[in-house]
């Protein structure tokens, strides 16, 4: 769905476009979901811009978003995560614009961390390893992780790994000897729930061990 | 053009007090994590804290309870409020984005007795 703007509706028959996206985050505090909603350009004038959601809630017909600078916010309990709902931009009652849209479809999980890379030395091997609150959760628990690791010297050559689970191996003999490397991870809704990539966790650095010349063999860090 | 430019390090007693200011342009803050990481003389860069778009908050082992992270959504500012300075907090600190094609400066902070 596109979310451009019915031009066509509006009196002054302005030009503005007011296409947005969203994204929903599960359990994002306690057990109370968000709703971030922003548009596409930052340069619409936001001045008299509301969002509203309407249908599939608990109790509730509507709600109104919080404007926070540039973006559009929800934190409550009342999604009932059953069917599409309606967001819409409005300039007082009048519907600029409108989406139908499943909050389980728009799913951004919250960020992984703890990321860290130990080196065995006698398995010759990096274990990664990071942790993600979406373990404890009730609904969006099951996620898929990807891995992007490079030297840092080769700004823009990731090398990346996909898994479902918290643990990764890197064989040292895959890796440049004496080497400084950079490692992240993020992740992405993999079962019933849809939606978006995660942020990058943190970053984590490490150095990879020079080879022993008398072996072909790294040395220890 | 993203731009990162880092504040407010200087020269500190141990245990005494330090904040550090970020500011941010050419992205969409209110949307972005930020991050603080941190680089001594002669080790690896190191993450420092995070803030998340919603708030939240983390922070490495060593500088729990010390070391408090904020941003102003309004200013595209990010701030490090550091307590308690230890002498291995001596390095360079650097704000960050996600991104990490993408450095500022830095601001350097040295504990000294």
């Known amino acids: 769905e596109s979310g451009y703007a019915q031009n066509g509706d509006l009196e002054d028959a302005e030009l503005d476009d007011y296409s947005f996206s969203c994204y929903s985050q599960l359990e994002v505090n306690g057990s109370q979901h968000s709703l971030t909603c922003a548009f596409e350009d930052p340069d619409v004038n936001i001045t008299n811009l509301e969002f509203e959601i309407c249908g599939a809630l608990v109790e509730v017909k509507c709600l109104n978003f919080r404007k926070l600078q540039e973006i559009y916010f929800i934190e409550t309990k009342k999604f009932l995560l059953i069917g599409k709902s309606n967001i819409c931009v409005k300039v007082g009652e009048k519907s600029l614009t409108c989406k139908k849209i499943d909050l389980t479809t728009i799913v951004k999980p919250e960020a992984p961390f703890d990321l860290s890379v130990v080196y065995r030395e006698g398995a010759n091997d990096f274990v990664v390893t990071f942790n993600t609150s979406h373990l404890q959760k009730k609904y969006v628990k099951v996620l898929m992780h990807d891995v992007a690791y490079r030297q840092e010297k080769d700004e823009n050559k990731w090398t990346h790994v996909n898994l479902s689970s918290t643990k990764l191996t890197l064989l040292q003999r895959k890796l440049q000897p004496a080497a400084m490397y950079e490692i992240k991870v993020r992740s992405i809704p993999d079962h019933y729930f849809k939606g978006f990539w995660s942020e990058w966790s943190p970053s984590y650095y490490f150095r990879t061990p020079e080879i022993n010349n008398s072996s072909g063999e790294m040395d220890p860090i | 053009q993203v731009q990162l430019v880092e504040s407010g390090g200087g020269l500190v007693q141990p245990g005494g007090s330090l904040r550090l200011s970020c500011e941010v342009s050419?992205?969409?803050?209110?949307?972005?994590?930020m991050h603080w990481y941190r680089q001594a003389s002669g080790r690896q860069r190191e993450w420092v804290a995070t803030i998340t778009a919603g708030g939240v908050t983390g922070y490495r082992d060593s500088v729990k309870g010390r070391f408090t992270i904020s941003r102003d959504n309004a200013k595209n500012t990010v701030d490090l409020q550091m307590n308690g300075l230890q002498l291995e907090d001596t390095a360079v600190y650097y704000c960050?984005?996600?991104?990490?094609?993408?450095w500022g400066q830095g601001t350097q902070v040295t504990v000294s007795s």
């Open positions: 960050n984005h996600g991104d990490t094609a993408y």
């Open positions: 050419g992205i969409r803050f209110s949307l972005r994590n």
